[in-house]
């Protein structure tokens, strides 16, 4: 089904957003304290593998940073440890818990050099800047058709109230640097560029700082020119995944195409023990196939209750009248051996189709792969 232009989907670094987690916890620690964050499994069920993330970046365990599936400890905390922390499911990147951590120490008398911050002090504990909605800060890539308008936002808080400045490709960015200028709204923590052109492509960084610390976020802007081109698949998506037997897996594939693309999820399969046909082209089966009416489509393939036979190589393929783009990726399924399971059947959402998929001829798709139906696959599995 097409997404339509009402929905604009953008690159979220392999994240599948789950249901909105509960209220973000605001935690304040003193300098030198041990920061301890706890994230019990929702509903008391099994947790599965998790990853801890700070300001959008995965935390690497060290002597000071102790990472467990349900608990994170940061020893001897300093101002640099302030920020937005989240615990996520490793496979789906779903946010299970998130915390806003501020590490403070009471400023000594005479600490204010210019006195200007005193007026801003709210009486709340002083602290370094932090993102007010960290779960909205994960998206990094914005691809926009030329002549449209772009807005980057970095809403933050801190005490004293932080300032915000903007860089383009690592250098100070001011209005005179682009035709048409820029519009800044400090109270909205935003930068607006109207009627973007290809020369606006680049990396845009917001730097939010006060005297206790600084945080930054970098966005990549791509400006799509309206000359017809074959579909573009976002770099890095979909990504290889490892799944536990019986778990659910979701893959993203981000497609940009001015001309309506035919989008497919395919899986490499074996027929009579062979992965390729007599002419050397790989066998693939169509899992999902549709025409997208959207210039941008964030397409997803959901595999429920995966078994070992779901492991293997998958393809996201987008075809328009100009050409084909495709991305291959792997799913590895591991865990205790379960009884042989039948192929995953289509769920109500129609994530995986079996048997009744209309197949497109090799000529239509450039003849790169042999297409076989799930019925054929059943046949070959059982013979």
């Amino acid at each position: 089904e097409s997404l339509g232009t009402e929905q604009r989907v953008v690159g979220r670094a392999a994240e599948v957003p789950g249901p909105e987690p509960g209220q973000q916890e605001q935690l304040v620690f003193g300098s030198g304290d041990a920061v301890e964050l706890s994230c019990p499994p929702p509903g008391g069920g099994p947790m599965g593998p998790t990853v801890w993330v700070k300001d959008g970046t995965g935390l690497v365990p060290s002597e000071r940073v102790l990472v467990g599936p349900q608990r994170l400890q940061v020893l001897n905390a300093s101002h640099e440890d302030s920020g937005a922390y989240s615990c996520r499911q490793r496979l789906t990147q779903r946010v299970l818990c998130h915390f806003s951590v501020r590490v403070t120490d009471a400023p000594s008398s005479g600490d204010d050099e210019d006195g200007e911050d005193e007026a801003e002090d709210t009486g709340v504990d002083t602290g370094a800047p932090y993102w007010t909605r960290p779960e909205r800060m994960d998206k990094k890539l914005l691809a926009v058709p030329a002549a449209n308008t772009v807005r980057f936002r970095c809403p933050a808080a801190g005490n004293p109230t932080p300032s915000i400045s903007w860089l383009k490709n690592g250098r100070e960015f001011r209005g005179e640097h682009r035709i048409g200028g820029i519009k800044l709204r400090h109270q909205q923590w935003s930068l607006v560029m109207e009627s973007v052109v290809p020369s606006d492509r680049g990396n845009y960084t917001c730097v939010v700082e006060n005297k206790f610390g600084s945080i930054r976020q970098t966005y990549t802007l791509d400006v799509l020119e309206r000359s017809p081109h074959r579909p573009i698949l976002q770099a890095g998506l979909p990504a290889n995944q490892t799944a536990v037997l019986g778990s659910d897996v979701e893959f993203h594939c981000k497609v940009y195409s001015d001309a309506q693309p035919h989008i497919q999820w395919l899986k490499h399969v074996e027929v009579n023990g062979s992965k390729v046909g007599p002419d050397g082209t790989p066998y693939v089966t169509v899992l999902k196939s549709w025409i997208s009416e959207s210039v941008e489509a964030d397409v997803r393939l959901r595999l429920a209750n995966v078994s070992e036979r779901d492991g293997g190589e998958y393809l996201c393929r987008a075809t328009n009248f100009i050409g084909v783009a495709e991305k291959a990726f792997w799913l590895s399924v591991h865990g205790p051996r379960a009884a042989e399971e039948e192929l995953v059947e289509a769920d109500e959402a129609g994530s995986v189709y079996a048997g009744e998929q209309k197949l497109i001829s090799e000529e239509d798709l450039g003849g790169e792969q042999k297409l076989i139906s799930e019925e054929d696959l059943h046949h070959h599995h059982h013979h």
Partner: antibody
């Protein structure tokens, strides 16, 4: 200079059809969208639908879905509003407007802004 | 659909007056709100987009503010050419919806 000129309005009987045209000039037609907005006599504005000419992607208001079709001919820099099964309540001045998007990673939608409008063409549905 | 309610429906003012029009959305529309001005028999003209950004070429006496559900259009010093009907419009949700309009008349 950006210009949008609507044509094709007139009197039509209930159940009849009409095709409106919107000729665009002064900007790159394929870079932005074209929206149709209507205004019944003495009433406010009502959004009808939108097309992005390069992709052919369209959206419609529920009140016209299935009866109205928006299309575009990029070689002629012209958008069209095909109106079928017309009703008395479709009587209005129909405007086309250049439409651009405000793209913002922080939110899950695109804000659409109509910055240049045509002069409008009157459609009267009456027996 | 998201309902947009403007108030007042009409107002009388004099040249030089400060005029404020409000627009309330039935649900949160963030800052996705535009203001348009329309004179009788003419097409609407864009004044403000994204709640507070002045469209190019629009006089600085016009300003917009607000976010979420409550928005304001302010004309700091009313000029003769400002007597018109003003519409707010949201586009976070489908379909885009307009307020019913506020008519600004000469006192």
């Amino acid at each position: 200079e950006v210009q949008l000129v609507e044509s094709g309005g007139g009197l039509v009987q209930p159940g009849g059809s009409l095709r409106l045209s919107c000729a665009a000039s002064g900007f790159t037609f394929t870079s932005t969208g074209i929206s149709w907005v209507r205004q019944a006599p003495g009433k406010g504005l009502e959004w009808v639908g939108r097309i992005y000419p390069t992709s052919g992607s369209t959206n419609y208001a529920d009140s016209v879905k299935g009866r109205f079709t928006i299309s575009a001919d990029t070689s002629k820099n012209t958008a069209y509003l095909q109106m079928n099964s017309l009703r008395a309540e479709d009587t209005a001045v129909y405007y086309c407007a250049r439409t651009y998007g405000i793209y913002d990673l922080y939110v899950d939608y695109t804000e659409y802004v109509m910055d240049y409008w045509g002069q409008g063409t009157l459609v009267t549905v009456s027996s | 659909d998201i309902q947009m309610t403007q108030s007042p429906s009409s107002l009388s003012a004099s040249v030089g007056d400060r005029v404020t029009i409000t627009c309330r959305a039935s649900q949160d529309v963030d800052t996705s709100l535009a203001w348009y001005k329309q004179k009788p028999g003419k097409a609407p003209k864009l004044l403000i987009y994204s709640a507070s950004f002045l469209y190019s070429g629009v006089p600085s006496r016009f300003s917009g503010s607000g976010s979420g559900t409550d928005f304001t259009l302010t004309i700091s010093s009313l000029q003769p050419e400002d007597f018109a009907t003003y519409y707010c419009q949201q586009s976070t949700g489908h379909p885009q919806t307009f307020g019913q309009g506020t008519k600004v008349e000469i006192k």
